[in-house]
Interface confidence: low
C-alpha cells in the first residue's frame, strides 16, 4: 500500500486546514492508528492528535478544540484531520504516520502554509498644487504572508516605487506614487491595487486627487464698443479665472472708489445707464488659498452729444 | 435558500437568565461568522456578540460581557446566546445574522438576517 | 469604540424624490461601511456592502458613496416601498456599531 497526502496545503488565515492521509491498500489490510505530528526544527516532533480505530480520536491539550476528523460518512482508511481556524503559528511541517495490518507503518509529512491577506492602506501625500515638481501623490501600504503585490491603476501619468520590510511572518510593501501636478489631473481616480495568493480577487483603494491651480485671469464685456455709450443700459464686466479652491472675486476701481450704483456680484460687475464718470481702469482681483491674479481693463464711456468724441463712422469705414 | 430562525425568547425576571437559539438553513453553516444584534422598542440596532465559523474566537460588547455567552453547534448549524443576570435594559428584540471572514478579525457586513425574537426583562 | 453619526435623524419625501442619508464616522474605516434598510416589525435588510456595493437584488435606484470617515446613502427616485428605517455600520474593528437611525417618512 502507500499514503495519499499532499506536499503543500495551502489555507487563508482563519480558514480550516485539512490536512490529508489516505492509505490506498489492499481490500484485507485495515488501519490501525494515524498519528498526527508537528515537525519542530527547534522543537523536534510534538503529537497533535492521534487517530486510533478502536480508542477514536485523542487530541494534544494544546490543540483542544482545533483537531477534528473530517465529517461524517468516514472512510476507515482516511486519517485526514481537520486544523480548525488555521493562524500564522501553525505555518510549518506535518507528520502522519500510519500504523496498518498487516502491511506495517507508512509516513508521510506535508508543509502547511497559512496565507495572511493584506488589508491595503492609502495615504495621500501632501497637497498637490500646479507648479510643483515630482510630488508624492499617494502611498499604499499591505501587509501579509507571502507579501502582497502592489501597484497603481490609474489614467494620470507618474511614477511608481516600492520598499519592502521583511517582519518574522510577514512582509510589509509600501508603494508610492509621484506624479508632476497638473490641473487636468483634478477629480482624476488614482487606485492601489494589491494582489496576494490568499485574496479572492485584487483589494482596491481609490483616492480621488485634488491638485490646487489659479488660472490668468482675464475680463470680458469690451468686446462691442457699441455698448459703452451713455445711456446705455445693461453693461457689464465679468472677470474670468478658473481654480481649485474656487477662487474669490473682487473688483476695485484703480483711481478712486467704484461709482456709485455699481454692483458686485461674484465676478460680475453690473453698471446703471453709465455716465462718463463710469470711465475708468477696473481692476479684476481674484484668488484662493494657493494664489491670486489681477486683470485691468480700460472703460471709455463715449458721449454721442459730444462732438469730440464721436466716431467718424465714414473714415472708420 | 439561506434560512435563519430564532427562538427562546420571552418573559424573564431581573436576574434571570434565557437561551437564545438561532436555527440555520441553506449554507454551510461552519463557514460563516454568526452575530447577535438587538433592537431595543423604538430604538436602534445594538451589536451584542460574535462568533467564528470555527467558534474559536467569541465577541462581546462591553454592555453584556461577563454575564452572556455565545456559542455554536456546527453540527446541529445551530447558534445560541446564554444571557444570565438579565437587566431591564437588556429587554430588545435579538436576531442573529450572518457573515464571512475576510481576513485577520475582519468580516463582511451581515447579508442574511433572521426575523428575530423578543425577550422582556420585567417583574 | 468607533462612533457612527447619521444624518438627518428623519426627513419627510415624496415618491419620485432624490433623497441622501449621511453618515460620519469617528475615525477612518476605509470602505468596511454596510447601509441597511428595516422596515417596522420586520429584519434588517442589506442594501449596500463595501461602502458602494448593490448587494445582489436590491435595485439599482439605491448607491452608495464615501471612504474614510464619510458616507452617503442616495434613494435616486423615492418609491412607496422604500419608507423605512436606513442604518449605517461599521465593521472595520469589533464591536461594529451602528448609526443611530435614519427614518424615512411620507411627505
Known amino acids: 500500500g502507500e499514503l495519499e497526502t499532499s506536499d503543500v496545503v495551502t489555507v487563508v488565515l482563519g480558514q480550516d486546514a485539512k490536512l490529508p492521509c489516505f492509505y490506498r491498500g489492499d481490500p484485507d489490510e485495515q488501519v490501525g492508528q494515524v498519528a498526527w505530528a508537528r515537525v519542530d526544527p527547534n522543537e523536534g516532533i510534538r503529537e497533535l492528535a492521534l487517530l486510533h480505530s478502536k480508542y477514536g480520536l485523542h487530541v494534544n491539550p494544546a490543540y483542544e478544540d482545533r483537531v477534528e476528523q473530517p465529517p461524517p460518512p468516514r472512510d476507515p482508511l482516511d486519517g485526514s484531520v481537520l486544523l480548525r481556524n488555521a493562524v500564522q503559528a501553525d505555518e510549518g511541517e506535518y507528520e502522519c504516520r500510519v500504523s496498518t495490518f498487516p502491511a506495517g507503518s507508512f509516513q508521510a509529512r506535508m508543509r502547511l502554509r497559512v496565507l495572511v491577506p493584506p488589508l491595503p492602506s492609502l495615504n495621500p501625500g501632501p497637497p498637490l498644487e500646479e507648479g510643483q515638481g515630482l510630488t508624492l501623490a499617494a502611498s499604499c501600504t499591505a501587509e501579509g504572508s507571502p507579501a502582497p503585490s502592489v501597484t497603481w491603476d490609474t489614467e494620470v501619468k507618474g511614477t511608481q516605487s516600492s520598499r519592502s520590510f521583511t517582519h518574522p511572518r510577514s512582509a510589509a510593501v509600501t508603494s508610492e506614487f509621484h506624479l508632476v501636478p497638473s490641473r487636468s489631473m483634478n477629480g482624476q481616480p488614482l487606485t492601489c491595487v494589491v494582489s496576494h495568493p490568499g485574496l479572492l480577487q485584487d483589494r482596491r483603494i481609490t483616492h480621488t486627487l485634488q491638485v490646487a491651480f489659479l488660472a490668468e485671469a482675464s475680463v470680458r464685456g469690451l468686446e462691442d464698443q457699441n455698448l459703452w455709450q451713455v445711456g446705455r443700459e445693461g453693461a457689464t464686466l465679468k472677470c474670468l479665472s478658473e481654480g481649485q479652491p474656487p477662487p474669490k472675486y473682487n473688483w476695485t476701481r484703480l483711481d478712486g472708489p467704484l461709482p456709485s450704483g455699481v454692483r458686485v456680484k461674484g465676478d460680475t460687475l453690473g453698471f446703471p445707464p453709465l455716465t462718463t464718470e463710469h470711465s475708468g481702469v477696473y481692476v479684476c482681483h481674484v484668488s484662493n488659498e494657493l494664489s491670486s491674479r489681477d486683470s485691468q481693463v480700460t472703460v471709455e464711456v463715449l458721449d454721442p452729444e459730444d462732438p469730440g468724441k464721436q466716431v467718424d463712422l465714414v473714415s472708420a469705414s | 435558500e439561506v434560512q435563519l430562525v430564532e427562538s427562546g425568547g420571552g418573559l424573564v425576571q431581573p436576574g434571570g437568565s434565557l437561551r437564545l437559539s438561532c436555527a440555520a438553513s441553506?449554507?454551510?453553516?461552519?463557514?460563516?461568522?454568526m452575530s447577535w444584534v438587538r433592537q431595543a422598542p423604538g430604538k436602534g440596532l445594538e451589536w451584542v456578540s460574535a462568533i467564528s465559523g470555527s467558534g474559536g474566537s467569541t465577541y462581546y460588547a462591553d454592555s453584556v460581557k461577563g454575564r452572556f455567552t455565545i456559542s455554536r453547534d456546527n453540527s446541529k448549524n445551530t447558534l445560541y446566546l446564554q444571557m444570565n443576570s438579565l437587566r431591564a435594559e437588556d429587554t430588545a428584540v435579538y436576531y442573529c445574522?450572518?457573515?464571512?471572514?475576510?481576513?485577520?478579525?475582519?468580516?463582511?457586513?451581515?447579508?442574511?438576517w433572521g426575523q428575530g425574537t423578543l425577550v422582556t426583562v420585567s417583574s | 469604540d468607533i462612533q457612527m453619526t447619521q444624518s438627518p435623524s428623519s426627513l419627510s419625501a415624496s415618491v419620485g424624490d432624490r433623497v441622501t442619508i449621511t453618515c460620519r464616522a469617528s475615525q477612518g474605516i476605509s470602505s468596511y461601511l454596510a447601509w441597511y434598510q428595516q422596515k417596522p416589525g420586520k429584519a434588517p435588510k442589506l442594501l449596500i456592502y463595501?461602502?458602494?456595493s448593490l448587494q445582489s437584488g436590491v435595485p439599482s435606484r439605491f448607491s452608495g458613496s464615501g471612504s474614510g470617515t464619510d458616507f452617503t446613502l442616495t434613494i435616486s427616485s423615492l418609491q412607496p416601498e422604500d419608507f423605512a428605517t436606513y442604518y449605517c455600520q461599521q465593521h472595520y474593528t469589533t464591536p461594529p456599531t451602528f448609526g443611530q437611525g435614519t427614518k424615512v417618512e411620507i411627505k
Open positions: 445574522a450572518r457573515a464571512e471572514l475576510l481576513a485577520f478579525d475582519v468580516y463582511t457586513a451581515s447579508d442574511y
Open positions: 441553506g449554507f454551510t453553516f461552519s463557514s460563516y461568522a
Open positions: 463595501a461602502a458602494s
